[in-house]
């Protein structure tokens, strides 16, 4: 017997559907109507035939009461080929729901997204996460998607993007966006970062994550942030192969005074990089290749320093910096 494609937990909280059959019974997903967090994995199916079965141009207000009864707060949709028109139809209907967090992963969006009709209501998401989503429209995808969202988005995460740079002139500002995560785009690099951080479109960013994004030096990142007018409080550059030295011909970059937390863990560093901010509340240099304790003049003024997992740290060694957070035990790096 084939397993049921959808499983709802006994608390009506989590519902997971895995549609792996070539012609799945989509009605099975109705058991998820009472769930708060829903995951639907479509097994790589092409959802084009759906367009024949639904009227994508129908007024979504006719579904408003039905959709309002859904408890879903967080929805994950993955592994499918989705016509843009179908995606838009879903977003229009979900605008009447309580949905706050949407994750799209391993999707291929085909065709172009139509413009938002005047009477349409945008989807009031607080969080949008995209992983390995390709768009037929190339660089304009964010601008096209953005018009279907209300301006209150707080968290935007874009991983394994096929086009991590955006068409900046088409993108509107994200006035409420406090967290931007571009991690896991190894081809991004510092030039790509400059293209992705559309100037003055991200005025409220507090947390910027750039793990595994092909960054080369903290100074190069500083320059990209300065050019975009982005002033994060927290910056994560972990899991990049960072160079400690700065290109002597590169202009010196002044970090924003707003930055108080910098993560440089798992960055392959053999010495503390040059050109760090002068003052930080938190600096994480754990799991690097530091062969000696950093000298005070090599470090910023820092309240909370983590050096765990570096070769120079032998268990029982005195802590190398006042206020440091080392456990004395080398973690599994």
């Amino acid at each position: 017997t084939t397993p049921e494609p959808c499983e709802l937990d006994d608390e009506d909280f989590r519902c997971v559907c895995n549609f792996s059959e070539p012609q799945p019974d989509w009605s099975e997903a109705f058991q998820c109507v009472s769930a708060v967090e829903v995951e639907i994995h479509a097994g790589g199916l092409n959802l084009e035939p759906f367009l024949k079965r639904v009227d994508a141009d129908a007024d979504p207000r006719q579904y408003a009461d039905t959709v309002k009864a859904l408890r879903v707060r967080r929805l994950t949709v993955g592994a499918a080929q989705v016509p843009a028109q179908l995606l838009v139809g879903a977003l229009r209907v979900l605008a009447y729901s309580r949905l706050k967090e949407l994750t799209l992963e391993d999707l291929k969006i085909t065709g172009t997204m139509p413009p938002l009709p005047l009477e349409a209501t945008g989807l009031a998401l607080s969080s949008l996460r995209l992983r390995n989503v390709s768009w037929a429209t190339g660089r304009s995808w964010l601008a096209e998607l953005q018009q279907w969202l209300k301006p209150g988005l707080k968290v935007l995460s874009i991983a394994q993007a096929h086009s991590p740079a955006f068409s900046c002139e088409q993108v509107r500002a994200f006035p409420a966006l406090t967290s931007l995560d571009l991690s896991d785009n190894p081809g991004l690099g510092e030039r790509g970062l400059m293209a992705a951080l559309c100037p003055h479109k991200f005025p409220a960013i507090q947390n910027l994550a750039l793990r595994n994004t092909g960054m080369e030096t903290p100074t190069g990142v500083c320059a990209a942030l300065a050019a975009a007018g982005v002033q994060p409080h927290s910056l994560d550059l972990s899991h990049n192969s960072l160079r400690a030295t700065v290109n002597p011909s590169a202009p010196r970059c002044m970090w924003s005074s707003a930055l108080n937390s910098l993560n440089l863990s798992f960055a392959g560093l053999e010495q503390v990089p040059k050109g760090l901010p002068a003052k930080l509340r938190v600096l994480d240099l754990s799991c690097n290749r530091l062969n000696r304790a950093p000298q005070p003049d090599e470090l910023p003024e820092v309240d909370n320093l983590t050096l765990d997992g570096n070769p120079f740290l032998v268990p029982g060694t005195a802590l190398p910096h006042e206020g440091s957070m080392n456990s004395g035990v080398v973690p599994a790096c």
Partner: antibody
Framework: QLQLQESGPGLVKPSETLSLTCTVS?????????WNWIRQPPGKGLEWIGY???????SYNPSLKSRVTISRDTSKNQFSLKLSSVTAADTAVYYC????????WGQGTLVTVSS | EIVLTQSPATLSLSPGERATLSCRAS??????????LHWYQQKPGQAPRLLIY???NLQSGIPARFSGSGSRTDFTLTISSLEPEDVAVYYC?????????FGQGTKLEIK
């Protein structure tokens, strides 16, 4: 059998941050459900503060949202509450609770806000 | 937010009598076929204990004298034959939409 245990200081000064941790045994906080904080001022009713779900998603009571952070440490199977800028009105027994029908409760810890 | 109003505030009955506690919601707490309304018992110095979930389902380990009914906005907790150990405060709670809210409680006393 699932068990939840709150820990943290019993006395917090006004304007400071209240910090509590809930340690979960007999179940994983990252495999399912919502993991809540609920409080009860002395002699009063129950108030839901917020939750962090198995996925790391959070939801907060709008009346406290500007002051509350709920986070988790999956390696220790713990989740935590931080409530900033506390006043005497935040004096309460704080419970950690599993699910949205609250079937599993910690025994509660009294936090008094006083100088 | 959904406001839950419990009545009466205090209920005083004799052992063996039937207790009926009411909970009214300011808007429906139903989502399709389910009513996301739950009942709890709290004794002094203890954490609340779940009695009934989704309006009418008896939580494991709870005596069968407890039952629940209702849908949409009107719900009832019934204790068919009161025992002395049923002295407690009873709360209803909705989990249909956040913020998840509680009623103000009904105090059950034994004469």
């Amino acid at each position: 059998q699932l068990q939840l245990q709150e820990s943290g200081p019993g006395l917090v000064k006004p304007s400071e941050t209240l910090s509590l941790t809930c340690t979960v045994s007999g179940g994983s906080i990252s495999s399912d459900s919502a993991w809540n904080w609920i409080r009860q001022p002395p002699g009063k009713g129950l108030e839901w503060i917020g939750y962090i779900s198995y996925s790391g998603s959070t939801s907060y009571n709008p009346s406290l949202k500007s002051r509350v952070t709920i986070s988790r440490d999956t390696s220790k199977n713990q989740f935590s509450l931080k409530l900033s800028s506390v006043t005497a009105a935040d004096t309460a027994v704080y419970y950690c609770v599993r699910g949205l029908r609250f079937a599993y409760w910690g025994q509660g810890t009294l936090v008094t806000v006083s100088s | 937010e959904i406001v839950l109003t419990q009545s009466p505030a205090t209920l005083s009955l004799s052992p063996g009598e039937r207790a009926t506690l009411s909970c009214r919601a300011s808007e429906s707490v139903d989502s399709y076929v389910n009513s996301f309304l739950h009942w709890y018992q709290q004794k002094p110095g203890q954490a609340p204990r779940l009695l009934i979930y989704r309006a009418s389902n008896l939580q494991s380990g709870i005596p069968a004298r407890f039952s629940g009914s209702g849908s949409r906005t009107d719900f009832t907790l019934t204790i068919s034959s009161l025992e002395p150990e049923d002295v407690a405060v009873y709360y209803c709670q909705q989990s249909n939409e956040d913020p998840y809210t509680f009623g103000q409680g009904t105090k059950l006393e034994i004469k």
